[in-house]
């Protein structure tokens, strides 16, 4: 699997997920979200060469296309295959308030 | 919707449904297909903008961060969303058998 | 330059609902909360809730909980602000406006307003 | 909730006089939870001073405002024509946000 646990010990150049580090402050503009500061959201890239972790049939014909026409711009693409939640915390007013924000994290890639 | 409706009748840069048509034996070196000779297959490409028809809240964030952080490499990829199946005919011996291949035909497209 | 730009004026049944927008522009606008302020004909301020969009956290007053919905729409940067079971008294003014940045915090820049009537 | 409560309701002064408006909180606001607003007849309310004491971008320096806990003032040190308005003390330290009933400004 494209997952954290092979992308993060390999220097993988096919599709894969990178870590991302987000300051939510400095690189989101929320002032709102009080704990964590940041998170790692990750995120998918590289390329998706013929039957790499192919999500649909029509991901691997694409994929299997490509390789036959080596000169089309149709290829699959590497995205988010696993997401993860992240629990915030935040502050109504002087009230703290905890919420779990869905989807927030990656954690594996695919090609689609 | 990023769709087939839409895309074929704009000129659109970002991210949007492409036309592709694939001959089974020429594209794709299928011998075995015998009807139909091809099919308009259909690709995602084009850039994903910040609230391009984002797929989740961390393809939402990560255009955000895109946005805000213009030298990053990070941004979503503009994949298929919805796809339908393709009724083909193919041969067993001298046995026609008609077979429905899920996920064939990409409708609509997304930034992941 | 920050807009906010809401909906026009609205005359509804009591019992019924309206549902008010407010498009932003010029700034980011899933880095701000969106608040919604109500103001029935010469008197005062009254706030309604919040709204955090990407995320779509809405924070209610109580007098409100129930009745009211706060959503983004953050691919068209449009916020809503839906009140249903419409009473004579709900005739207000309704303003959003763009906080600071927190839940709860001053108002840097307001729309200019829908006025919504609510009689019989 | 947190009441708000503004004095006076009403002020009638002579222009380049000083305005001073106050504003009592029902329980303690910390210091910096208060925001205040002037509102023109048919206009939507505008910031003038948020964290009790911050002047907004763009507000003129004749406007400011003090005070933290339960008691807090707003001041323009010498009015002017364009000052004609009511104006509105808001706190933000606990939900609901609550208003003051306002001040109406007024030139002599």
């Known amino acids: 699997a494209l997952d954290t646990n092979y992308c993060f010990r390999n220097l993988e150049e096919n599709c894969c997920v990178r870590p991302l580090y987000i300051d939510f402050r400095q690189d989101l503009g929320w002032k709102w979200v009080h704990e964590p500061k940041g998170y790692y959201a990750n995120f998918c890239s590289g390329p998706c060469p013929y039957l790499r972790s192919a999500d649909t049939t029509h991901s691997t014909v694409l994929g299997l296309y490509n390789t036959l026409n080596p000169e089309a711009s149709a290829s699959p693409c590497c995205v988010p295959q696993d997401l993860e939640p992240l629990t915030i915390l935040y502050y109504v007013g002087r009230t703290p308030k905890v919420e779990q924000l869905s989807n927030m994290v990656v954690k594996s890639c695919k090609c689609s | 919707a990023l769709d087939t409706n839409y895309c074929f009748r704009n000129l659109e840069e970002n991210c949007c449904v492409r036309p592709l048509y694939i001959d089974f034996r020429q594209d794709l070196g299928w011998k075995w297909v015998h009807e139909p000779k091809g099919y308009y297959a259909n690709f995602c490409s084009g850039p994903c903008p910040y609230l391009r028809s984002a797929d989740t809240t961390h393809s939402t964030v990560l255009g955000l961060y895109n946005t805000l952080n213009p030298e990053a490499s990070a941004s979503p990829c503009c994949v298929p969303q919805d796809l339908e199946p393709l009724t083909i005919l193919y041969y067993v011996g001298r046995t026609p058998k008609v077979e429905q291949l899920s996920n064939m035909v990409v409708k609509s497209c997304k930034c992941s | 330059q920050v807009q906010l730009v809401q909906s026009g004026a609205e005359v509804k049944k009591p019992g019924s609902s309206v549902k008010v927008s407010c498009k932003a522009s010029?700034?980011?606008?899933?880095?701000?909360?969106i608040s919604w302020v109500r103001q029935a004909p010469g008197k005062g301020l009254q706030w309604v809730g919040g709204?955090?969009?990407?995320?779509?956290?809405?924070n209610y007053a109580q007098r409100f909980k129930g009745r009211v919905t706060l959503t983004a729409d953050t691919s068209t940067n449009t916020v809503y602000m839906e009140l249903s079971n419409l009473r004579t008294e709900d005739t207000a003014v309704y303003y959003c406006?763009?906080?600071?940045?927190?839940?709860?915090?001053?108002?840097?820049?307001w729309g200019q307003g829908t006025l919504v009537t609510v009689s019989s | 909730e947190i009441v708000m409560t503004q004095s006076p309701a009403s002020l009638s002064l002579s222009q380049e006089e000083k305005v001073t408006i106050t504003c009592r909180a029902s329980?303690?606001?910390?210091?910096?939870?208060l925001a205040w607003y002037q509102q023109k007849p048919g206009q939507a309310p505008k910031l003038l001073i948020y964290?009790?004491?911050s002047r907004a971008p763009g507000v003129p320096s004749r406007f400011s405002g003090s005070g933290s806990g339960t008691d807090f003032s707003f001041t323009i040190s010498s009015l002017e024509p364009e000052d004609v308005a009511v104006y509105y003390c808001?706190?933000?330290?606990?939900?609901?946000?609550?208003f003051g009933q306002g001040t109406k400004l007024e030139i002599k």
């Open positions: 964290g009790a004491s």
């Open positions: 808001q706190q933000y330290a606990d939900s609901p946000i609550t």
């Open positions: 329980q303690s606001l910390g210091s910096s939870y």
């Open positions: 406006a763009r906080t600071l940045g927190l839940v709860l915090d001053a108002m840097d820049y």
């Open positions: 709204v955090i969009p990407i995320v779509d956290i809405a």
């Open positions: 010029g700034y980011t606008f899933s880095s701000n909360v």
